[in-house]
Interface confidence: medium
């Protein structure tokens, strides 16, 4: 697994840097994150012939991923700080579940599985503290997401193989999308 | 090969409005960073619009905002430039361009040619 | 808005000088910075990106270093076909920025 935010060589050569703001720690993390996914994707991608398929097979699939929308008010047009950042913790409070279900879905990047879904935690923690308004944060019911596990790990070999795709599309296309908006606050 | 190529240039009027297109192959725009920059003659360069492709989303410099408008076709594997209300100061070279982002990697990798917009009476 | 301050606006050298080219940024970018090469009439081409690190088929004279608000750009050794005009782009957020330039002319 790669080595968290704030311990890459380069920090560690060059210990008189000036400490990472609020801002730069987040947009450092996801990024972290982001690296975690594309090594999940390879692996997804070597395995199976899911990278290639079409949108259109895609989006026929069931699943209830969080996605950006105009009224998220992460875009630049009616774009608001406090509703965006709402969306994006709510967002990464529901992917939580689909992170769970890729625990078990990789033989040589296990670790970078698990990797991924701590550093998300830590991300909603650093995400929390800048929010006002935790009160509009919505978290997701656990026996929901309990029934939602059972059913996802239920599915055959091939379906399972394109939630993995899916999931993991999905959550670096958010976490990118999050990204931009962070960077307007 | 990946490359774009662009039209929709020429002289017009102040008030007017233009068109911009920028084709693109060997790369699918659809998961692509789009954007627009443009050059004044003699002088630097100057971000314009972008466009994310995972949502559709637009972002604006302040001097177009609400007069520009950049969109795609994704079937035509195209992206537009629509400029209204144009001004003197709009004057200048048009760079369609494509933005590598792939989190850890963020810059510039692909430019058209160019198209010149001149806005004069 | 970031601003990018390029610093010299021209730059005169001679073929074989070691030139460096300079810009801040009004507020900490992280290694989101870019060089660009422009030559009249020309796109701009991409030299350097996140910083320091060189494009695919840029020769090895050029080099980028820096991280935060002070950025450089180095060529160590001009050619001939060096002579042009040089930008720093801060890829951070939107608004997305360009140095004002530095024309690199023959002495």
């Known amino acids: 697994a790669p080595v968290p935010p704030g311990e890459d060589s380069k920090d560690v050569a060059a210990p008189h840097r000036q400490p990472l703001t609020s801002s730069e720690r987040i947009d450092k993390q996801i990024r972290y994150i982001l690296d975690g996914i594309s090594a999940l994707r390879k692996e997804t991608c070597n395995k199976s012939n899911m990278c290639e398929s079409s949108k259109e097979a895609l989006a026929e699939n069931n699943l209830n991923l969080p996605k950006m929308a105009e009224k998220d008010g992460c875009f630049q047009s009616g774009f608001n700080e406090e509703t965006c950042l709402v969306k994006i913790i709510t967002g990464l409070l529901e992917f939580e579940v689909y992170l769970e279900y890729l625990q078990n879905r990789f033989e040589s990047s296990e670790e970078q599985a698990r990797a991924v879904q701590m550093s998300t935690k830590v991300l909603i923690q650093f995400l929390q503290k800048k929010a006002k308004n935790l009160d509009a944060i919505t978290t997701p019911d656990p026996t929901t997401n309990a029934s939602l596990l059972t059913k996802l790990q239920a599915q055959n070999q091939w379906l399972q193989d394109m939630t993995t795709h899916l999931i993991l599309r999905s959550f670096k296309e958010f976490l990118q999308s999050s990204l931009r908006a962070l960077r307007q606050m | 090969e990946v490359q774009l190529v662009q039209s929709g240039g020429g002289l017009i009027q102040p008030g007017g409005s233009l068109r911009l297109s920028c084709a693109a192959s060997?790369?699918?725009?659809?998961?692509?960073?789009m954007i627009w920059v443009r050059q004044a003659p003699g002088k630097g360069l100057e971000w314009v619009s972008d466009?994310?492709?995972?949502?559709?989303?637009?972002y604006y410099a302040d001097s177009v905002k609400g007069r520009f408008t950049m969109s795609r076709d994704i079937s035509k594997n195209t992206v537009y430039l629509q400029m209204n209300s144009l001004r003197a100061e709009d004057t200048g070279v048009y760079y369609c361009?494509?933005?590598?982002?792939?989190?850890?990697?963020?810059?510039?990798?692909?430019w058209g040619r160019g198209t010149l917009v001149t806005v004069s009476s | 808005d970031i601003v990018m301050t390029q610093s010299p606006s021209t730059l005169s050298a001679s073929v074989g000088d070691r030139v460096t080219i300079t810009c801040r940024a009004s507020?900490?970018?992280?290694?989101?910075l870019a060089w660009y090469q422009q030559k009249p009439g020309r796109a701009p081409k991409v030299l350097i990106y996140?910083?320091?690190t060189l494009e695919s088929g840029v020769p090895s004279r050029f080099s980028g270093s820096g991280s935060g608000t002070d950025f450089t750009l180095t060529i160590s050794s001009l050619q001939p076909e060096d002579f042009a005009t040089y930008y720093c782009?801060?890829?951070?957020?939107?608004?997305?920025?360009f140095g004002q330039g530095t024309k690199l002319e023959i002495k």
């Open positions: 361009a494509r933005w590598a982002d792939d989190h850890n990697n963020t810059y510039i990798d692909v």
């Open positions: 060997g790369f699918t725009i659809s998961s692509n960073y």
């Open positions: 466009l994310y492709y995972y949502a559709g989303d637009t």
């Open positions: 507020q900490g970018i992280s290694s989101w």
């Open positions: 996140k910083a320091s």
């Open positions: 782009a801060a890829h951070y957020a939107a608004p997305w920025t």
